[in-house]
Interface confidence: low
């Protein structure tokens, strides 16, 4: 039996198609501001967006098994539709200006349309034909169409107001919509032609759906759900009154989700997404930043990319011809991300959370979350205050500085402590970067009145000051072993400088229009930096050919940036510390001749075997 479903702020309710029946709330907890609504009839599940929680959720019709399927990187997800054949979820976000897709469980998320989108709102799918339709509410409102993989985009209805409630009559092949500027309900054929006004005397029609011979709509002024004949607009009936701000409305019935395409059979044999295209075809799609392999079926993860962090998010960006948009990685419970790093061997992301005073790691999909460093006194998490971190990928260690104890610590990637390698009465080590290829670490020492940039061996010995003049607050470091260069940003002097790894050939790279540089990284021949105050990522070509370029603007609360290069396993294995830490119990260092020597943290001494550390 068909019935109406509608969303109303903190409610999703069902009601009979007939008049004067009570509506019944689906028992859902935690809904704040439900907006777009759709269903999957074969699963008996409903899907909805919540523009207050900024999530997309689903549950069975009885309210059970409620789960958020998308909860990152949403702003105003005000359009959403279920691809019932490919088992995909499509949504339009008027805040991010993106149309995205994922599997129904939120996996394999990809951005389909992101260029020249101005407040995309209502979204409707025709999976049997391979088309998606959406409305835009920006400066020039319109109705657009594209293939369901985002290709073949075209404008169907350019001369329209803010169109909402976009609905397809699959049997008669017509589009229906409400126009919030003219307060009309209109219809056209699937090409946007043969336009007809179905109703022109309504105070505020908003949501709309179609079923059999009727259209059903919500009216914000009349506070009602009404219906009329879909072609003439006659035989109007009020289904229910006294309903405030009904956002979306639809008819739940199998006839609204019929048809067939290749994606309905074994996901089109695609490893990730199967996306319908006209007419009746399909293409395999990949999660964001993944690439489709030569077999046109499977996908490969990116190996070269940029990570950047905001206060409560870690984002990934790839540099490609399509100018693919950056994405937020689905990592939970980020309170105040201060610094990030990446281990390309285990493909794990590491970060310092300065609100929780801990170092954590996780996979890019948010799984395998693990706290690597946390205070040993649980009630007193100010005992340690990690400031910056740098991974020695060969020894599998994290070097990290601590604001509370003013030392440089070493911790294994699995969380076991190695010990303190650098500590001094006047020391204030802050930014740190390791160069395990040469056995050194570099750090900024923000001693009162005499900030320095220093170098030391990875065990804290051979310590030397590289720079002590021309510094005020050197806040960030970056190093490129291939180029043999060290880079730093000074947030007080508002400039970025570089030198050789020995400290020679110091030069100012950039000192104009920099307000608050807080992180930098090297990516191929480019030096990238983030400016927290200008909310911007910029880059400069170190070959001098292309100069300075703005990469991305309007990113609030930036904190760090880190480039990830593809790991050459052959080169990696050639590093003498890569095999079982060079046989060392604690610290493995490469000497000038390419051989290793073992060393110890400050509280231990090297034993006679020259491999192990023990109590002095």
């Amino acid at each position: 039996e068909a019935f109406l479903l509608f969303s109303r702020r903190a409610d999703i309710r069902r009601i009979s198609l007939e008049t004067n029946n009570n509506n019944v709330a689906i028992p859902l907890t935690g809904v704040k501001e439900a907006s777009a609504l759709d269903f999957d009839v074969t699963d008996n599940r409903i899907y909805w967006t919540d523009i207050s929680l900024k999530t997309i959720s689903r549950a069975f019709m009885n309210g059970s098994a409620l789960e958020h399927v998308v909860e990152f990187g949403l702003d105003y997800p005000e359009g959403m539709a279920v691809d019932w054949l490919g088992k995909n979820l499509y949504w339009a976000d008027t805040g991010t200006n993106r149309i995205e897709v994922s599997k129904l469980d939120g996996q394999h998320r990809q951005v389909l349309v992101w260029k020249d989108l101005d407040s995309p709102r209502a979204l409707a799918l025709d999976p049997a034909e391979g088309f998606m339709y959406w409305t835009e509410w920006g400066g020039k409102p319109k109705i657009d169409r594209a293939a369901m993989d985002g290709s073949e985009r075209t404008t169907l209805v350019p001369n329209v107001g803010r169109a909402n409630g976009l609905t397809i009559d699959y049997a008669k092949r017509r589009l229906y919509w409400t126009d919030l500027d003219t307060n009309l309900i209109e219809s056209s054929n699937m090409l946007g032609l043969n336009r007809e006004v179905i109703a022109d005397d309504l105070p505020h029609p908003f949501g709309l759906t179609q079923y059999q011979d009727y259209i059903y709509w919500t009216d914000w002024s009349r506070r009602s759900i009404e219906r009329a004949n879909k072609t003439s607009g006659q035989n109007r009936t009020i289904i229910q009154g006294h309903l405030d701000y009904v956002m979306d409305i639809l008819v739940f019935h199998s006839s609204r989700q019929s048809g067939w395409n290749e994606c309905a059979s074994s996901n089109g044999h695609c490893s990730h997404l199967c996306l319908a295209v006209p007419v009746g075809g399909f293409v395999c799609g990949c999660p964001a930043h993944y690439s489709l392999n030569a077999d046109n079926r499977t996908c490969s993860a990116p190996t070269t990319f940029l990570l950047f962090s905001q206060k409560s998010a870690i984002n990934r960006m790839v540099i490609d011809e399509q100018q693919s948009p950056d994405i937020i990685l689905p990592i939970h419970s980020l309170r105040n991300v201060r610094a990030i790093d990446y281990d390309p061997l285990d493909k794990q992301l590491y970060w310092i959370d300065s609100r929780q005073n801990m170092i954590r790691k996780a996979q890019e999909d948010g799984s395998q979350g693990f706290t690597v460093v946390v205070s040993s006194v649980p009630s007193q998490n100010l005992e340690i205050q990690p400031y910056d971190l740098s991974i020695d990928i060969y020894s599998r260690y994290i070097y990290w500085t601590c604001e509370a104890t003013n030392v440089i610590n070493v911790t294994r990637l699995d969380g076991r402590s190695v010990g303190v390698v650098l500590k001094g009465e006047q020391d204030r080590p802050r930014a740190v970067v390791v160069n395990p290829e040469k056995g050194y670490m570099y750090f900024t020492n923000l001693q009162e009145r005499s900030p320095k940039i220093e170098r030391a061996a990875l065990d804290g010995t051979e310590r030397e000051v590289l720079f002590f003049s021309g510094l005020s607050k050197p806040i960030a470091l970056a190093l490129d072993s291939r180029l043999g260069k060290l880079f730093w940003a000074d947030s007080d002097l508002r400039r970025i400088e570089s030198s050789d790894l020995s400290g020679a050939n110091r030069i100012v790279l950039e000192d104009s229009n920099i307000l608050q540089p807080v992180g930098l990284t090297v990516f191929e021949n480019w030096l990238y930096w983030i400016d927290k105050q200008q909310q911007m990522i910029e880059k400069i070509d170190m070959t001098g050919r292309e100069g300075r370029t703005k990469v991305q603007a309007r990113i609030a609360q930036l904190s760090d940036i880190h480039a990830v290069k593809e790991l050459n396993l052959q080169e990696y294995r050639q590093h003498p510390c890569a095999q079982d830490n060079g046989g060392c119990s604690h610290i493995c260092l490469v000497k000038g001749d390419g051989t290793t020597r073992c060393s110890c943290p400050m509280h231990l001494v090297l034993l006679q075997d020259e491999l192990s550390c023990g109590e002095p």
């Epitope: 207050s52 105003y76 008027t94 509410w137």
Partner: antibody, heavy 119, light 108 residues
Framework: QVQLKESGPALVKPTQTLTLTCTFS??????????VGWIRQPPGKALEWLAW???????SYSTSLKTRLTISKDTSKNQVVLTMTNMDPVDTATYYC???????????WGQGTLVTVSS | DIVLTQSPATLSLSPGERATLSCRAS???????LAWYQQKPGQAPRLLIY???NRATGVPARFSGSGSGTDFTLTISSLEPEDFATYYC?????????FGQGTKVEIK
């Protein structure tokens, strides 16, 4: 329903520090996504945003008044306090507190409290 | 800081007439980062529109917002007696959020 009420001195002498308290009900600052802001309006003039604080203790201040303002919250008491140092007669205004939900739109306001700065 | 300039400063109209209020930003503020408030004498402001075009709860349908980029408009399709007040726009695209200087809609 959401309610906010400002309280503080009606009269402040020049160079003194003004302390205003916003007591609210109908929402909580321990819930993700909300916050409270302060806005003032000199007699017959336009609104001027001063500061806000959110559920996560993030704070933001007006550029021109940043050095004089401090905002804080007491979640358990449902209160937000604004202090403004070195008061001057040009600071005479009605001071409003208002609730916001991200984005930073003030959807509920207090009735305002008139503060006069005079010796 | 982003400066919002409202025009006209005063609008003299009769009940039933259409009112069009303009708010221009000194730089790009997106398509969703503008709000409109109504303030009557002796009262606190009241939120009318957020996200440039979304009506706040309880706001009559005669109020509509539009615009994008730097130019925004508040339209009152048919003025009711209770609509005569001062209207302020506010941007929240960039810190610090700023208000316009206001447009007073008075009875002609």
């Amino acid at each position: 329903q959401v309610q906010l009420k400002e309280s503080g001195p009606a009269l402040v002498k020049p160079t003194q520090t003004l302390t205003l308290t916003c007591t609210f009900s109908g929402f909580s600052l321990s819930n993700r996504g909300g916050g409270v802001g302060w806005i003032r309006q000199p007699p017959g003039k336009a609104l001027e945003w001063l500061a806000w604080i959110d559920w996560d203790d993030d704070k933001s201040y007006s550029t021109s008044l940043k050095t004089r303002l401090t905002i804080s919250k007491d979640t358990s008491k449902n209160q937000v306090v604004l202090t403004m140092t070195n008061m001057d007669p040009v600071d005479t205004a009605t001071y409003y507190c208002a609730r916001f939900h991200l984005p930073l739109v003030f959807d509920s306001w207090g009735q305002g409290t008139l503060v006069t700065v005079s010796s | 800081d982003i400066v919002l300039t409202q025009s006209p400063a005063t609008l003299s109209l009769s009940p039933g007439e259409r009112a069009t209020l303009s708010c221009r930003a000194s730089q790009f503020i997106g398509s969703r980062y503008l709000a409109w408030y109504q303030q009557k004498p002796g009262q606190a402001p009241r939120l009318l529109i957020y996200g440039a075009s979304n009506r706040a709860t309880g706001v009559p349908a005669r109020f509509s917002g539009s615009g994008s980029g730097t130019d925004f408009t508040l339209t009152i399709s048919s003025l009711e007696p209770e609509d005569f007040a001062t209207y302020y726009c506010q941007q929240y695209y960039d810190y610090p959020q700023t208000f316009g200087q206001g447009t007073k809609v008075e009875i002609k």
